[in-house]
């Protein structure tokens, strides 16, 4: 069908609550484009009827709420005047009862669910709530070990919980809760956050921390387009460079002629006492020569790699 496939990272989500994912891919969605969502390679688009539990809302796919059976690969097709891209998003839904068990045992949790407070400082936690404009979010309540947080040192500021004079006792399992209103109906959103305490001044001293990748392999089909983010946390005043290298050479230099593999534009999100940086690497078309080669994300003195590998043959097809 002439659409270029792009594989995004997995999202691990909690059942029985709202979830939304925005189909944005800056090089493409910045212009005049149409966006259509599909599930599991279905030819039938996701409904745009706002009363549907799962529906498309502008560029978003919205689940009101998410259910256990919603796990799967969703595709959003971005069509421009002269281009077509199909972005694959793997959603995994789990049953999570925040008060029963620790969030710590879950695989691949994003940085949003693991946050750090700095001992002896004033710091904050952030409740990440990403929903389209049609969703109205009420005031956020915060919980620690399933008890609502109240006390002298805690103040709520929009999506943040301000914590004064952080102590070692502040580590643990937190949750932020908000009531989401959509088309007159109310839903509860509850995000779990595992909080650790660091004694180091600044955000981990001057050594940046690479959150992703984690020195692992990625299965990817030959000929596909692949985008991999490198997520780095570092101090706000850092002077570290972040980049992707292969064979100890900047990817933009290594693939200077073909431009088949490129480093993306760095973006960052500013937290109270650290920045979260993202710089991606784009494989426009994965070739045989890419397999088995470590693609290194560098951030100051820190490094982490990904290695592409061919998926194992699926014998069920025969």
């Amino acid at each position: 069908d002439g659409c270029k496939d792009i594989f995004m990272k997995n999202e691990i989500l909690s059942a029985s609550q709202p979830f939304a994912f925005n189909c944005t891919f800056p090089p493409i969605t910045s212009g005049e484009v149409s966006v259509t969502w599909y599930k599991n390679s279905s030819k039938i688009p996701v409904s745009k009827i706002i009363q549907s539990r799962i529906h498309q809302d502008e560029t978003w796919i919205l689940f009101l709420p998410m259910e256990w059976g919603d796990s799967g690969v969703y595709q959003c097709v971005i069509k421009g005047r002269d281009s077509c891209h199909r972005i694959h998003v793997n959603l995994t839904v789990f049953e999570k009862h925040w008060c029963d068990t620790s969030i710590g045992g879950l695989p691949n949790l994003s940085d949003e669910y693991k946050q750090i407070l700095h001992l002896g400082k004033d710091d904050s936690l952030t409740c990440h709530l990403h929903f389209p404009k049609s969703c109205v979010l009420g005031p956020i309540k915060w919980y620690k070990d399933c008890n609502e947080i109240k006390g002298e040192r805690f103040t709520v500021l929009e999506t943040r919980l301000l914590v004064s004079n952080v102590s070692a006792e502040d580590r643990g399992n937190y949750a932020c809760q908000a009531i989401l209103t959509h088309s007159g109906k109310q839903y509860e959103v509850l995000n779990g956050i595992t909080v650790s305490i660091t004694e180091r001044a600044g955000y981990g001293g001057s050594v940046p921390k690479i959150i992703y990748p984690k020195n692992h392999s990625i299965e990817v089909q030959l000929g596909t387009t692949l985008i991999v983010d490198c997520n780095v946390t570092d101090t706000k005043d850092n002077t570290n460079l972040r980049c992707w290298r292969v064979n100890n050479t900047l990817v933009d230099d290594y693939y200077d002629e073909s431009k088949r593999i490129r480093e993306g534009v760095e973006t960052h999100v500013s937290f109270r006492e650290h920045n979260l940086y993202t710089v991606n690497i784009t494989f426009l078309e994965v070739k045989m020569e890419d397999y088995g080669l470590p693609f290194m994300c560098h951030a100051g003195v820190s490094t982490a790699y990904i290695i592409l590998q061919l998926p194992a043959p699926d014998f069920r097809a025969y």
């Epitope: 005031p139 002298e152 709520v156 004064s164 706000k236 500013s270």
Partner: antibody
């Protein structure tokens, strides 16, 4: 000891920008946030906004489009600007700081500076 | 935003007598309430934080109580220097908000 002192013109014309400076001593702006509060002639107090130790800012919703807060850490100064003022902005303006171990309340205040908006 | 309502607006009391000031929050603020005292030409001065804890240097004739939505400041035996305006402030949730004040005047 911890001190904060506001300074700036006492008279501002309507539609102009009100500019104030808070000069601090006894602590570093890289360690503590500085808040701005105003008090109307009728005595009501209103929290306007804050510049955090990392330089980020937050504002009370009615002020988001009109207020700018910045700082020069080396000079121990915080700058406050309120644009498009009207006579309703006539008030005493305070800068303030929380206590070392306290929550979000103000243990230390400047002496305040009266700003009158009038043509 | 959370609205803080103080009563009465003015309280006329004789020196040596007990004074009780009230502050109500429009929603639950736990104990994140502070009382300030303000005299003419001066900045507010913190008296009681966390609803019932005296700030450093505050005489023990000042006491605070309450939680949730209802709070009280009590001055057990009024001294001449206590006649001033008193404000409550909540710091449970931004925007930080203040009561409109209670003026304590000599009867």
């Amino acid at each position: 000891q911890v001190q904060l002192q506001e300074s700036g013109p006492g008279l501002v014309a309507p539609s102009e920008t009100l500019s104030l400076t808070c000069t601090v001593s006894g602590f570093s702006l890289t360690d503590y946030a500085v808040h701005w509060i105003r008090q109307f002639p009728g005595k009501g107090l209103e929290w306007i906004g804050v510049i955090w130790s990392d330089g980020s800012t937050d504002f009370n919703a009615p002020f988001k489009s009109r207020v700018t807060i910045s700082k020069d850490t080396s000079k121990n100064q915080v700058s406050f600007k309120l644009s498009s003022v009207t006579t309703d902005d006539t008030a005493v303006y305070y800068c303030a700081r929380k206590g070392g171990y306290s929550g979000s309340w103000f243990a230390y205040w400047g002496q305040g500076t009266l700003v009158t908006v009038s043509s | 935003e959370i609205v803080m309502t103080q009563s009465p607006a003015t309280l006329s009391v004789s020196p040596g007598v007990r004074a009780t000031l009230s502050c109500k929050a429009s929603q639950d603020v736990g104990t994140n309430v502070l009382w300030y005292q303000q005299k003419p030409g001066q900045a507010p001065r913190p008296l009681i934080y966390s609803a019932s804890y005296r700030h450093s240097g505050i005489p023990d004739r000042f006491s605070g109580s309450g939680s949730g939505t209802e709070f009280t400041l009590t001055i057990s035996s009024l001294q001449s220097e206590d006649f001033a305006v008193y404000y409550c402030q909540q710091y449970s949730r931004y925007p930080l908000t203040f009561g409109q004040g209670t003026k304590l005047e000599i009867k």
